[in-house]
């Protein structure tokens, strides 16, 4: 506990002090006081440097004195033989004696008292920056007008902190500018702009004069700019030494001006403004930016449009453009969005054709469709080559996005018909010679396949049975063989409107317009034994001349049998209509003059007894196409005849092409009746 005064006596005082002793006293007076220590008696064995016995006075780490020998007062009015004055409130006294004393020494008597110190004058380091005021037991500092005492209660400075600047433009100067700035001050200014704006500071060299650096290059007075984790400065000297334009890349800036006690100059003045935060002009592949600018800043919006063939995809959907905003952090929004090649996906399959597996389905890729040759060909042109277009569709130069259509090749038998022996007078044939040949089992008759969905036959074949059962692809019509062939199911029968329906068909004498179409429920798959015959063209090239040869085929009556089991065929020439008129009708059901002959009929036969007969009705009279010798077209349909083995009459198909086409077009989709 600190005391104001006290007494210190050597051991056994005033008797002789013992040998080999060491004793210490710790003196402490209250804070703010010094210590006056004085000796009134001193009798200690004398030795050089007081090496044997001594009393030692220590202040902190400093030895204030070391005493030995005898002393007496120089002043008759004062008993003090030795004294010490220390400006500190703590002191240590240590007494030591060695192992032998030649004489008897009495030691010492000392006293201490707390004394006031003048902190303002007693120390080398002045405790106050400006005014120092001493009082007993302490001191206090005070400041001149307009200065304030800092929290350390020693330093004075001007009150130049706490200003926050939020305007987008402004000016800041050191206190009193351009008069000398205050000493011993720390001025802090804060600029806080809206996010998205960066603080830009501009200074002029001549607007800056701050105490220069010391010999080591350290600024004594300094100006520092702090923006987040970036610092600019410290700056000092005559004329601003830093960049005259400081882009802080931050919306928050702290300005710190620190001065010391000496060397005040005029200070500094600066301007600042908020620049919208720039965003980098990024190189986004496969896209264009609109608007295109040299520099983009906070709040700028660009539309990024993908180049043709590229898109932005999210999940299963995509877009060809998007918007991106320059944000307050100097980065673009939607920077994750990238224009990537359009994917057209796996191409659709087509009926009766195929597309090879594409290596890629991305923009620019090419695929090729082919038809199942030789039975199908590409009807709608374009060559079957499609490329993946910018809109995500597979596109053909001719057809656009429309898929190619594989339609049956018509009129080309897999094997040509060769007569081997002299229907009546005809030869055995194979279905591959006449793959269009259709067999009707009730009534026993024929027909001609003209495409996947339609069979052409004679009206008289279907007038009595509007739901005929038909077969294709078999040479033999034996029941066992038919079971293995392709059965065709009709959907609807269309009889020519010019065909007159009779109560008693057996008595018919008028076979004009003997033509009918059967729409099938399902498409027929073509192959070597099943393929259609062509229809005649409308040009004059398809007008038959007398003598033109045609082929007929069927399972009708022969010389030997009422019905043939295996397909028969014959080649016969076109004859003038009068030749048919001249033949006497076998088993007439009416007067010979009652039979009607019209330009809708072709007369053919009469050569070597080759003719069609009962059971061949509806089959095609196939003639070589004048414009393509590899193909046959249905010039006629087996209709009627005066007598088997002579001349026969065939429906002139060319006269009905318009009706056929119209009927097929109007009924191309399945009926819902």
């Amino acid at each position: 506990e600190p005391t104001m005064y006290g007494e210190i006596l050597s051991p056994n005082y005033p008797q002789a002090y013992p040998s080999e002793v060491e004793k210490s006293w710790d003196i402490e007076v209250p804070e703010g006081y010094g210590i006056h220590l004085y000796f009134t008696h001193l009798d200690i064995e004398l030795s050089e440097n007081c090496a044997y016995d001594s009393v030692q006075i220590i202040s902190g780490d400093t030895e204030e004195g070391r005493l030995c020998g005898q002393r007496s007062s120089n002043n008759p009015h004062s008993p003090i033989v030795e004294e010490f004055q220390v400006p500190y409130n703590k002191l240590q006294v240590i007494f030591k004696s060695d192992f032998s004393n030649e004489e008897r020494f009495t030691g010492f008597a000392a006293y201490y008292v707390a004394t006031d110190i003048n902190e303002c004058t007693d120390f080398v380091d002045v405790p106050c920056s400006h005014f120092c005021n001493n009082f007993i037991g302490g001191y206090f500092c005070s400041c001149p007008p307009e200065y304030f005492l800092h929290d350390d209660m020693k330093n004075c400075g001007v009150n130049c902190s706490g200003d926050v600047f939020t305007a987008l433009i402004g000016e800041i100067a050191s206190p009193n500018y351009p008069k000398p700035y205050p000493e011993n001050s720390r001025c802090e200014y804060q600029i806080r702009l809206e996010k998205g704006f960066q603080v830009v500071v501009t200074l002029r060299r001549e607007d800056f004069d701050v105490e220069a650096a010391d010999s080591a290059g350290n600024c004594l007075d300094s100006l520092v700019f702090v923006a987040g984790d970036r610092q600019f400065g410290p700056y000092c000297g005559h004329g601003f030494p830093g960049p005259l334009n400081i882009e802080t890349k931050s919306n928050a800036l702290d300005i710190i001006f620190q001065t010391d006690l000496t060397g005040q100059k005029k200070g500094w003045k600066l301007r600042y403004h908020g620049d919208p935060m720039p965003c980098p002009k990024e190189d986004t592949p496969n896209s264009v930016w609109e608007p295109a600018k040299a520099k983009y800043v906070f709040r700028d919006v660009v539309q990024i449009t993908c180049l043709d063939g590229f898109e932005v995809v999210e999940g299963r959907v995509g877009a060809t453009s998007f918007y991106s905003t320059c944000q307050s952090n100097g980065k673009w929004s939607n920077s994750k969005l990238k224009c990537q090649p359009v994917d057209c996906g796996i191409p659709e399959s087509i009926a009766n054709g195929k597309v090879e597996d594409p290596e890629s389905t991305l923009f620019g890729s090419v695929i090729r469709y082919t038809c199942e040759e030789p039975y199908y060909y590409m009807e709608n042109g374009g060559g079957g080559e499609y490329h993946c277009a910018g809109n995500g569709s597979w596109v053909n130069e001719v057809l656009g996005p429309e898929l190619p259509k594989c339609v049956p090749v018509c009129g080309v038998p897999r094997e040509p018909f060769e007569e081997k022996q002299r229907i009546i007078g005809g030869s055995d044939a194979d279905i591959k010679n006449f793959p269009w040949q259709v067999f009707f089992d009730n009534p026993w008759a024929g027909g001609a396949l003209i495409n996947e969905y339609w069979v052409l036959t004679a009206a008289h074949v279907v007038e009595g049975n509007r739901e005929p059962t038909m077969y294709v692809g078999s040479t033999s019509v034996q029941t066992s063989r038919l079971a293995k062939s392709k059965m065709l199911t009709p959907e609807h029968v269309f009889i020519h409107p010019g065909w007159k329906l009779l109560e008693v068909p057996e008595g018919r004498t008028n076979f004009d317009n003997d033509i009918a179409l059967v729409r099938l429920k399902d498409p027929v798959k073509m192959g070597p034994t099943v393929s259609p015959i062509c229809l005649p063209g409308t040009s004059s090239d398809y007008n038959l001349m007398d003598g033109d040869l045609g082929l007929i085929s069927g399972w009708g009556r022969t010389e030997k049998r009422d019905r043939a089991v295996r397909l028969k065929a014959a080649r016969l020439p076109v004859a003038p209509l009068r030749k048919c008129k001249e033949v006497k009708v076998e088993k007439p059901t009416a007067d010979a003059e009652a039979y009607v002959f019209t330009p809708n009929m072709i007369c053919a036969g009469g050569e070597k007894g080759m003719d069609s007969c009962k059971g061949d009705s509806g089959g095609a009279f196939a003639v070589q196409d004048p414009n393509d010798k590899t193909k046959f077209y249905a010039a006629g349909l087996v209709s009627w005849g005066p007598q088997c083995g002579t001349y026969g009459l065939y429906t002139r198909v060319k006269n009905y092409v318009d009706w056929i086409m119209k009927t097929m077009q109007e009924n191309s989709t399945p009926r819902e009746d």
Epitope: V301, V312, E314, G315, F322, Y323, T325, N329, K336, L337
Partner: antibody
Framework: QVQLVQSGAEVKKPGASVKVSCKAS????????MHWVRQAPEQGLEWMGW????????IYAQKFQGRVTITADTSTNTAYMELSSLRSEDTAVYYC?????????WGQGTLVTVSS | DIQMTQSPKSLSASVGDRVTITCRAS??????LDWYQQKPGQSPKLLIY???YRYSGVPSRFSGSGSGTDFTLTISSLQPEDFATYYC?????????FGQGTKLEIK
């Protein structure tokens, strides 16, 4: 399939903070933006902000600036939204949503009730 | 910030009706506008993006149109499951803002 599963309902006192999590599955959050949208009872939708988990860039609506913190942990494929200094008007259902072009997938929502 | 204003705030209609909801932006948002449907107790669901593109799985009776500041969501023939609240949202620039919603109720 894509799913966003949010943490359960919370009851907080005024002045407190709340942290809502949004665990993603079926996709990598680094490839998308993760947004937070809130809906006060019987009110409309209010966008709060987003994070790009790839680089932790965030953008907040001015209204929530200083109170909201959106973070993401790419190792667990989870996004978080912390709202501090809660007041009674912060009582709402908080949704996380994933976007690139649009907000295609949303979490089921987390009800945060602020009551003394 | 861009303000989004929807009208009407609510409307009553019957199954089979044709319904139109409009959304107006306080400034040009080009075509950066999406429409969402929300049913009570559920999260919002995306219907239309980029003003006019139907999101996958959304029935064809929903269509969107408009650009700039005026946008429309049309439901050609209301179905019972369409009664909900509809929100527009601009994604032109942050902050992305929603309209206040249009509640579609059964008449």
């Amino acid at each position: 399939q894509v799913q966003l599963v949010q943490s359960g309902a919370e009851v907080k006192k005024p002045g407190a903070s709340v942290k809502v999590s949004c665990k993603a599955s079926g996709f990598n959050i680094k490839e998308y933006y993760m947004h937070w949208v809130r809906q006060a009872p019987e009110q409309g939708l209010e966008w709060m902000g987003w994070i790009d988990p790839e680089n932790a860039d965030t953008i907040y609506a001015q209204k929530f600036q200083g109170r909201v913190t959106i973070t993401a942990d790419t190792s667990t494929n989870t996004a978080y939204m912390e709202l501090s200094s809660l007041r009674s008007e912060d009582t709402a259902v908080y949704y996380c949503a994933r976007s690139r072009l649009f907000f295609a997938y949303w979490g089921q929502g987390t009800l945060v009730t602020v009551s003394s | 910030d861009i303000q989004m204003t929807q009208s009407p705030k609510s409307l009553s209609a019957s199954v089979g009706d044709r319904v139109t909801i409009t959304c107006r932006a306080s400034q040009d948002v080009r075509t950066a506008l999406d429409w969402y449907q929300q049913k009570p107790g559920q999260s919002p669901k995306l219907l239309i993006y980029s003003a006019s593109y139907r999101y996958s799985g959304v029935p064809s009776r929903f269509s969107g149109s408009g650009s700039g500041t005026d946008f429309t969501l049309t439901i050609s023939s209301l179905q019972p499951e369409d009664f909900a609240t509809y929100y527009c949202q601009q994604q032109y620039t942050t902050p992305y803002t929603f309209g206040q919603g249009t509640k579609l109720e059964i008449k």
